[in-house]
Interface confidence: medium
């Protein structure tokens, strides 16, 4: 029962995580205009992986896609790739894990096959989560670098009087969504891998013994009944299943580019 619960919970947690990774990838607020210590402008800039947007005070929002592939920074391309790989792996993992779920019967699929599929999907979720976390972290690092670079030359004197304020960008909501979603996918994957151990049929350390009675020939194999039903308790692994996944905290981001040249 604990195996089924762990597997089911791992599947649900991974599903939520992958949905979050997809959401983060599509979101426009990967970087948002830093409002601290800046003159108050009537426009708010923010950027995603695919387009940059400007929200004006009147409520009008204008977004422009990055219609170039070669002109974009290699780091941005790398982040895009990591997020897409994460989504693809996660989606395949979800597909595999559906068939691996213990509560779903498909033909005469053996527990060993389900165990293998559960392990495969678990590994896929782990890699998917790591891809998302890596992608978001690379972007965050890029932002931090650009932030301090633009702070260093924030005010460029022109004739002593004119000041050109450089727009600085800070972490957008998508980064926090991505980190949390990647973490959930990772946790879900670990849970699937744990569930796999419970699904695998227990191997015996001794061979079957034949007992010969007069006039009868009966072979008794220890554990045979347990393997044929789905109700055997796996005492060896029981202590593993003691709780569900939980995120440490929920991060809120303030709701408009490090310039892509």
């Amino acid at each position: 029962m604990a195996v089924t619960a762990c597997q089911g919970l791992g599947f649900v947690v991974s599903l939520i995580g992958i949905a979050g990774i997809i959401a983060a990838t599509c979101m426009d607020q990967w970087s948002t205009q830093d409002l601290y210590n800046n003159p108050v402008t009537a426009v708010f800039n923010y950027q995603g992986l695919w387009r940059s947007c400007v929200r004006e005070s009147s409520g009008f929002t204008e977004c422009r896609g990055y219609f170039t592939l070669l002109g974009l920074p290699a780091m941005l391309q790398a982040v895009r790739a990591l997020m897409i790989v994460g989504i693809v792996l996660g989606a395949i993992g979800l597909l595999v894990s559906i068939f691996a779920l213990k509560c779903i019967r498909i033909g005469s699929m053996e527990d060993s096959a389900k165990a293998n599929m559960t392990l495969t999907s678990g590994i896929m979720f782990i890699v998917s989560g790591l891809c998302a976390i890596a992608g978001v972290s690379v972007f965050a690092n890029m932002l931090v670098t650009n932030f301090w670079m633009s702070t260093a030359n924030m005010y460029t004197g022109m004739g002593g009087m004119v000041q050109t304020v450089q727009t600085r960008y800070t972490f957008g909501a998508a980064l926090f969504v991505g980190w949390v979603a990647g973490g959930l996918t990772l946790i879900g994957g670990v849970m699937m891998c744990i569930a796999c151990r419970g699904l695998a049929p227990e191997e015996t350390n001794y061979k079957a013994v034949s007992y010969h009675a007069s006039g009868h020939s009966v072979a008794y194999k220890p554990g045979g009944f347990k393997a044929s039903t789905g109700f055997g308790s796996n005492t060896k692994n029981k202590k593993i299943y003691d709780g569900g996944a939980r995120t440490e905290d929920e991060v809120q981001s303030y709701p408009s580019k490090h310039d892509y040249v």
């Epitope: 402008t41 009537a42 426009v43 940059s52 400007v54 009008f60 304020v165 580019k257």
Partner: antibody, heavy 117, light 113 residues
């Protein structure tokens, strides 16, 4: 067609309060922002504040403590209230429509004269 | 607050002449997000409210004669009247449309000889 018309008291005693109403027609206050601008006699234009379509308000920081802007979308009216009036508040007060932000103030009222004396 | 400096404060020209007036901002009015300059030019004739001529530094408002041209980016902007007409007698104001408060320049008074 688009029209804006200001109406005010004309003459106000020092330290008193002022209330000017801008009645608009030809457009909706839920779609466009309205700005207030004043012009002292023989001087330049001074931006006072704006109330955006969504209801958010921005003021000239120098006058922020004395100003308030509100609107009644159903009556198509925008209100400018200003307290602790001094003689240097004597000016022509205009309301102007923001077509949408970044496109400038495309329609202006004829203005209402305020004399603080 | 952003300071908008207009020059010259006044100028007198003959009809048909080309006129150029300048507007300088104490901070850049160019938004990097959409590469748009948030600056507007207004014309105010005696006894009338201001009239919008140019927005976004260079886009002519509909109905404005094509002799009026706006140019510039960042902190330096120019309004050019290619061939001044008698009806162009007015004061011309530039306005910062980017930073709050939306400050106006002190104006350039155009007189016709």
């Amino acid at each position: 067609q688009v029209q804006l018309k200001e109406s005010g008291p004309g003459l106000v005693a020092p330290s008193q309060s002022l209330s000017i109403t801008c009645t608009v027609s030809g457009f909706s206050l839920t779609s466009h922002g309205v700005h207030w601008v004043r012009q002292p006699p023989g001087k330049g234009l001074e931006w006072l504040g704006v109330i955006w379509a969504g209801g958010s308000i921005n003021f000239n920081s120098a006058l922020m403590s004395r100003l308030s802007i509100s609107k009644d979308n159903s009556k198509n009216q925008v209100f400018l209230k200003m307290n602790s009036l001094q003689s240097d508040d004597t000016a022509m007060y205009y309301c102007a429509r923001d077509y949408y932000y970044g496109i400038g103030l495309d329609y202006w009222g004829q203005g209402t004269t305020l004399t603080v004396s | 607050d952003i300071v908008m400096t207009q020059s010259p404060s006044s100028l007198s020209v003959s009809a048909g002449e080309k006129v150029t007036m300048s507007c300088k901002s104490s901070q850049s009015l160019l938004n990097s997000g959409n590469q748009k300059n948030y600056l507007a030019w207004y014309q105010q004739k005696p006894g009338q409210p201001p009239k919008l001529l140019i927005y976004g530094a260079s886009t002519r408002e509909s109905g404005v004669p094509d002799r009026f041209t706006g140019s510039g980016s960042g902190t330096d902007f120019t309004l050019t009247i290619s061939s001044v007409q008698a009806e162009d007698l007015a004061v011309y104001y530039c306005q910062n449309d980017y930073y709050y408060p939306f400050t106006f320049g002190s104006g350039t008074k155009l007189e016709i000889k």
